[in-house]
Amino acid sequence: QSGPLPKPSLQAQPSSLVPLGQSVILRCQGPPDVDLYRLEKLKPEKYEDQDFLFIPTMERSNAGRYRCSYQNGSHWSLPSDQLELIATGVYAKPSLSAHPSSAVPQGRDVTLKCQSPYSFDEFVLYKEGDTGSYKRPEKWYRANFPIITVTAAHSGTYRCYSFSSSSPYLWSAPSDPLVLVVTGLSATPSQVPTEESFPVTESSRRPSILPTNKISTTEKPMNITASPEGLSPPFGFAHQHYAK
């Protein structure tokens, strides 16, 4: 045996954003003929010798970071990328609004504002059909997501979540959808890839912050966070059952 065994992949099905009360399964996938899988939950560290974890009813205590490894003979693999399992619907939904308007002429600027009834300091903005989310911490009680020089690619349906940085895996219900319409177009735009859209790959299974030039704020550049793996496209539709 030269070098460690390659890491397995860990995925949440159907999604790593799980409404309270819903079911989810975590699956660790290694090469064929693995002797033993170990699935770990972090904080506090605990483990099961299984290649899957079925959670029939999502609870707050299930949220957190998971990773897995496998053993062949006496050798252990590298650990998988960590999977962040997020419980949603823990708090009331925030409100999402567009300023100055949700109908924006092409080339103009618009700010999407996510406001929570709680003093949360973290907000996540999702666009339906995209594999990425815009995420940034904000002081005070609101999060502004400025979109500078709007293009056709920005039109679509957006939702936001809010949460506290002290409990980063317990999120609110999603906001009601906000439809951003980019006006002054000759035809309905197709969903074209932009710098805000990143395919979810093995390496982005653990949300990672990627810089972008497209989105900016008055304070500092906006970051784009690759979304948790396993959301069934189109992205936002997996969560519509929240809006009751």
Epitope: K41, E45, K46, Y47, D49, W76
Partner: antibody
Framework: QVQLVESGGGLVKPGGSLRLSCAAS????????VSWIRQAPGKGLEWVSA????????QYAESVKGRFTISRDNAKNSLYLQMNSLRAEDTAVYYC????????????????WGQGTLVTVSS | QSVLTQPPSVSGAPGQRVTISCTGS?????????VHWYQQLPGTAPKLLIY???NRPSGVPDRFSGSKSGTSASLAITGLQAEDEADYYC???????????FGGGTKLTVLG
């Protein structure tokens, strides 16, 4: 109450073999990971081997790999350590210890220990 | 050579506060694994003292406390008593080979 009682220690010559036993009581033995941990005279603790509840998951410290075999008999609530090719540096008190468990999860620490059995490897 | 590093000995007078450090690496404590502490009184088996970095099992006095930061952890004992004289071991888990690792142990002497 939880009890772990080791036995089988004694004096053995280098290259010889010995089989240690640990009798468990006061808990559902087959649900728990258990380990062997040793302590050389005047020295610190060294984890030796661990085994999962069903007996299929086993792990060994590098220092004993290929020489020691851990096993269990859940029907007898017993844990075993077969020690072959013994060396002077294997001289120690051998403890069996239970890993803490809560619901379906195992934890990486030991909540109950036996009183230990002394193994002396000397010619 | 133990995987986790502890001072061989510490001492203090009755009523004083002492701390015992435990230093690991990026593959054990630094990989996110918790640190646990055991007390071994002379001639007896080790006993769980602190689990999950800072939690006390029932029956352990609140004079004992633990903390963890980065790749190291520490055990603090306040209001030192004669019966605290013992060996103290830290323990964690190593991600590389999935093995359980201990510190070399620290002998606590209560002076006077």
């Amino acid at each position: 109450q939880v009890q772990l009682v080791e036995s089988g220690g004694g004096l053995v010559k280098p290259g010889g073999s010995l089989r240690l036993s640990c009798a468990a009581s006061g808990f559902s033995f087959g649900d728990y990971y258990v380990s062997w941990i040793r302590q050389a005279p005047g020295k610190g603790l060294e984890w030796v081997s661990a085994i999962g509840g069903s007996g299929s998951a086993v792990q060994y410290a590098e220092s004993v790999k290929g020489r020691f075999t851990i096993s269990r008999d859940n029907a007898k609530n017993s844990l075993y350590l077969q020690m072959n090719s013994l060396r002077a540096e294997d001289t120690a008190v051998y403890y069996c210890a239970r890993h803490y468990r809560e619901f379906r999860w195992h934890y990486y620490y030991f909540d109950y220990w036996g009183q230990g059995t002394l193994v002396t490897v000397s010619s | 050579q133990s995987v986790l590093t502890q001072p061989p000995s510490v001492s203090g007078a009755p009523g004083q506060r002492v701390t015992i450090s435990c230093t690991g690496s990026s593959s054990n404590i630094g990989a996110g694994y918790d640190v646990h502490w055991y007390q071994q009184l002379p001639g007896t088996a080790p006993k769980l003292l602190i689990y999950g970095n800072s939690n006390r099992p029932s029956g352990v006095p609140d004079r004992f406390s633990g903390s963890k930061s980065g790749t190291s952890a520490s055990l603090a004992i306040t209001g030192l008593q004669a019966e605290d004289e013992a060996d103290y071991y830290c323990q964690s888990h190593d991600l590389g080979a999935h093995v359980w690792v201990f510190g070399g142990g620290t002998k606590l002497t209560v002076l006077g």
